[in-house]
Structure formats: structure tokens, C-alpha cells
């Protein structure tokens, strides 16, 4: 799994007038890391992970650079023509990755009102855009604006690619990113459903990294995909993640079902509690 740094910048317009604020969220290896608006950048998440790892840094250069990027994006939004009345957003997402073989990847994506309309591979400088006419119009609009000062743009995008990787390497070197493994806490719960069925839910929480396999098995065999419902893998605010999987089974057959969990090379199975016990907890080490 590569190390990654992801910048998510958002600016807004109201009735065609670009608003003065902006919001930038930075994710490091998928973790919320920094949140910046105006002249403020705060380390995220505000949990023990942040305290232990991020220490008492001011994020001065990050604040300065990201504020500059926010201003640039506001100028870009001002050049998008035919903005309708009401609230509109322009989002720029920039991602750079360093893989285990030391190869790198960088990309940039623009979204208008949440819809992707333009992407660029920052290494090859290749642009791509969706086929819809709306996306094409927006893309032409923005690209023309970015091309107005071709030399500046060329330098700007080279710098974005280089700076992103430079910052990521700096964070890796300084120990901000820890290649750590935190095993999940697994809970299995049941809730009565109609007509002799019950819903069983398997929740995994407090794990890192985010890659996890969570599924229901009947007599040791995985249930088909369409009989299970999965939750997203989400940050829990403490530098770790949480997720869940649920399925509906016949009452009385609980002993045939187990929740299977695999994380960072370890795996475990968790039975459905009997009717009298609501929650069964187990935490493997």
C-alpha cells in the first residue's frame, strides 16, 4: 500500500460572486491530517494520535502554501462562466503517492458542484475529462484560464507535483507517518426482524491500516455478496477506522453463522450471540 498525501480544496460562490473563504483538508495515508481555512491550519485528528505524532508544530509553511492555493482556486472559480444563481462550489483534489518500489504518482482533479469535470496526471501533464457536454464546457473554461499564463502554469504544476512529493517525503522522514498496525475490536450484535428473521451485524472498530475483510459465513462458507450489506470504512477520529457488515438470517439458525474478519495478515471468526446475550466482544492480538 503506497504512502499518500491528498489535498482537498473547496471554494464557494453565491449568485456568481466568489466568497472570500476557502476550506482545505489534507489527508496523510488516508488519515485526516490538517484542516485549513483562511489563515488557520489545525492538525487533525484531534486525538491522542495527533498529540503523539504531530507534536506542537505550527504548520506555518503549510498554512501559507495552502492559503495561496485557496486564493488561486478562488480566481479559477471567478473565471467559470455562466454561473447560475445560488450556491456553487469548485473543488480541487490533489493526490501524490510514493509506492514501495519508490515509484511516484501525482494527479489533480477538479469538481464543480460535486461533479468531476477535469483531471490531470501531474507527471505526464495529460488532461482527461468526462464525456458530458457540461463537463467539457467547464473543462475548456478552466483550462483556458490556466493556459492564459502558460509559463506560470507549467511551473505551477511542476511545483505542485514536486512540492506534494517533497512534503510527503518530509512527513515520512519526520515520523509523522507511522507504519503501525492496530487490530480491530469486533462486536457481533443481533436485532429482531419480522417473520422469524433476525438481522445480525458485525462491527469492526479501532483498526489501522484501513484495509480489512469483513464478511458473514454460513457453515464456514462465505455468503454471496448480494445477501450482505456493508458499511463504508470510515475514520473514527482517533487515527483508526471502523466499518460493519450485516445480513438477515432465520431465527434458530444463529449457530451456523459466523463473522469472518481479516486484517494485516491476522484473521478471526466471531459467532452470533444467543438470544439472551446482546453483544459479544472479542479483541484479538
Amino acid at each position: 500500500e503506497p504512502h499518500s498525501l491528498r489535498y482537498n480544496l473547496t471554494v464557494l460562490s453565491w449568485d456568481g460572486s466568489v466568497q472570500s473563504g476557502f476550506l482545505t483538508e489534507v489527508h496523510l495515508d488516508g488519515q485526516p491530517f490538517l484542516r485549513c481555512d483562511r489563515q488557520k491550519c489545525r492538525a487533525k485528528p484531534q486525538g491522542q494520535w495527533a498529540e503523539d505524532v504531530l507534536g506542537n508544530k505550527t504548520w506555518d509553511r503549510e498554512t501559507r502554501d495552502l492559503t495561496g492555493n485557496g486564493k488561486d482556486l478562488r480566481m479559477t472559480l471567478a473565471h467559470i462562466k455562466d454561473q447560475k444563481e445560488g450556491l456553487h462550489s469548485l473543488q480541487e483534489i490533489r493526490v501524490c503517492e510514493i509506492h514501495e518500489d519508490n515509484s511516484t504518482r501525482s494527479s489533480q482533479h477538479f469538481y464543480y458542484d460535486g461533479e468531476l469535470f477535469l483531471s490531470q496526471n501531474l507527471e505526464t501533464k495529460e488532461w482527461t475529462m468526462p464525456q458530458s457536454s457540461r463537463a467539457q464546457t467547464l473543462a475548456m473554461n478552466v483550462r483556458n484560464f490556466l493556459k492564459e499564463d502558460a509559463m506560470k502554469t507549467k511551473t505551477h504544476y511542476h511545483a505542485m507535483h514536486a512540492d506534494c512529493l517533497q512534503e510527503l517525503r518530509r512527513y515520512l522522514k519526520s515520523g509523522v507517518v507511522l507504519r503501525r498496525t492496530v487490530p480491530p475490536m469486533v462486536n457481533v450484535t443481533r436485532s429482531e426482524a419480522s417473520e422469524g428473521n433476525i438481522t445480525v451485524t458485525c462491527r469492526a472498530s479501532g483498526f489501522y491500516p484501513w484495509n480489512i475483510t469483513l464478511s458473514w459465513r454460513q457453515d464456514g462458507v462465505s455468503l454471496s455478496h448480494d445477501t450482505q450489506q456493508w458499511g463504508d470504512v470510515l475514520p473514527d477520529g482517533n487515527g483508526t477506522y471502523q466499518t460493519w457488515v450485516a445480513t438477515r438470517i432465520c431465527q434458530g439458525e444463529e449457530q451456523r453463522f459466523t463473522c469472518y474478519m481479516e486484517h494485516s495478515g491476522n484473521h478471526s471468526t466471531h459467532p452470533v450471540p444467543s438470544g439472551k446475550v446482546l453483544v459479544l466482544q472479542s479483541h484479538w492480538q
Partner: antibody, heavy 117, light 107 residues
């Protein structure tokens, strides 16, 4: 042009709190942090803390956490610093300085505080 | 706290000479160093930010360099109006801290 106008010199009795003011003009007051810096006679500069006028968020040097209280009045574009229970150690010139990404780009003229009985 | 050590405490030079002020940080602060000039009975004035970035209105004879822990402010041709105290300030780690200063005198 950017200007920071600080209140006049203060002679205070030990233990009696004192409030210094810094009136900002020539820029958008709520968009910039405001720093406060202490300078003892013949000595160097010491950062006390900073406040963001938009929401009064403060960052205080732990050394001054029981000594200095930073506030702002957005309606008058004024930043304040209150010094509690002053002693002779608090006799100094106090500067307010506008923050520009953690550099102090504009400074007030300073307020001299003398603590004496 | 980050300790900034400025040396020497006093520099004595002749007009027209090139002079360098040193500031050493107790740990790596990348390029988060800023330089100020304070004339007698005056307020400090920002000269250089982020180690080497120039400030509008500051004469071009002032320049800065360095990264990590060692930083230098240079005046490439000293003038009489440059007689003052010079302070470095770091902004990488809370709390913000200043060096003890270097006094520039004319011979």
C-alpha cells in the same frame, strides 16, 4: 496603510491588573492574527501569544498562561492584552504586531509598562 | 521550546563592509526563520521571512540564507542607518521564539 496604534505608557501598582490596547487600521482586522511581544529594558524579544479576531481563538506561550489574557473588539478593530497581578518582572515594553503567516510584518509603537509601588 | 542562538553578541564593522549575522536553532526548523531589525527606541521591523524571502520596502542589500538549523542574515554593504539590534525568530514549533539578538555597531 497598515497602522497599529497602542495605548500610552502605564504606571501600575504591584498586583493591580493592567489592560493594554492596540487599534488596527488600514487592513481587514478579522483576517489576520494579532501577536503580542514583550521586551524587558535592554533585553530581547519574547512572544506572549496571538489571537485571531474572527473568532477570538488564542495561542498563548505557556510561560504567560497565568499572566496574559488576550481579547478583541471587532467593532472598534482593537486588540487588548490584560496582565494580571503585575510584579516588577512585568515592567517592559509590550508590542502588538500583525501576523502574516507567523511572521510579524507590522508593529505598534509599543506600550511601556512600569510596575512600581 | 526551540532555542535560537545568535552570534556574535556584538558586531563592529566599517561602512561599506559586508557583514553576516548567524542564528542557530536547537533543532531542525526547515526554513521557518525570520529576521528583524530594531533601531534604538524603535519598534522591530521585518527584514527577511522564511530564511531567504525578501520583504517589500526593505533595501536589497539585506539577504538571508540557510535551512535546517543554521541561518545567516547578510548586509552586503553596511550603511550608517543599519546600526541596530538584529533578531531572528522561528515559527516552526510553538511557542514562537526569538534569538537574544546581535548588536551592529560602526567602527
Amino acid at each position: 496603510q497598515v497602522q497599529l496604534q497602542q495605548s500610552g505608557a502605564d504606571l501600575v501598582r504591584p498586583g493591580a491588573s493592567v489592560r493594554l490596547s492596540c487599534r488596527a487600521s488600514g487592513y481587514s482586522f478579522t483576517n489576520y492574527w494579532m501577536n503580542w511581544v514583550k521586551q524587558r529594558p535592554g533585553q530581547g524579544l519574547e512572544w506572549i501569544g496571538m489571537i485571531h479576531p474572527s473568532d477570538s481563538e488564542t495561542r498563548l506561550n505557556q510561560k504567560f498562561k497565568d499572566k496574559a489574557t488576550l481579547t478583541v473588539d471587532k467593532s472598534s478593530n482593537t486588540a487588548y492584552m490584560q496582565l494580571s497581578s503585575p510584579t516588577s518582572e512585568d515592567s517592559a515594553i509590550y508590542y502588538c504586531a500583525r501576523d502574516d503567516f507567523f511572521t510579524m510584518d507590522y508593529w505598534g509603537q509599543g506600550t511601556s509598562v512600569t510596575v512600581s509601588s | 521550546d526551540i532555542l535560537l542562538t545568535q552570534s556574535p553578541a556584538i558586531l563592529s564593522v566599517s561602512p561599506g563592509e559586508r557583514v553576516s549575522f548567524s542564528c542557530r536553532a536547537s533543532q531542525n526548523i526547515v526554513t521557518s526563520i525570520h529576521w528583524y531589525q530594531q533601531s534604538t527606541n524603535g519598534s522591530p521591523r521585518l527584514l527577511i521571512k522564511y530564511a531567504s524571502e525578501s520583504i517589500s520596502g526593505i533595501p536589497s542589500r539585506f539577504s538571508g540564507s540557510g535551512s535546517g538549523t543554521d541561518f545567516t542574515l547578510t548586509i552586503n554593504s553596511v550603511e550608517s542607518e543599519d546600526v541596530a539590534d538584529y533578531y531572528c525568530q522561528q515559527s516552526n514549533i510553538w511557542p514562537l521564539t526569538f534569538g537574544a539578538g546581535t548588536k551592529l555597531e560602526l567602527k
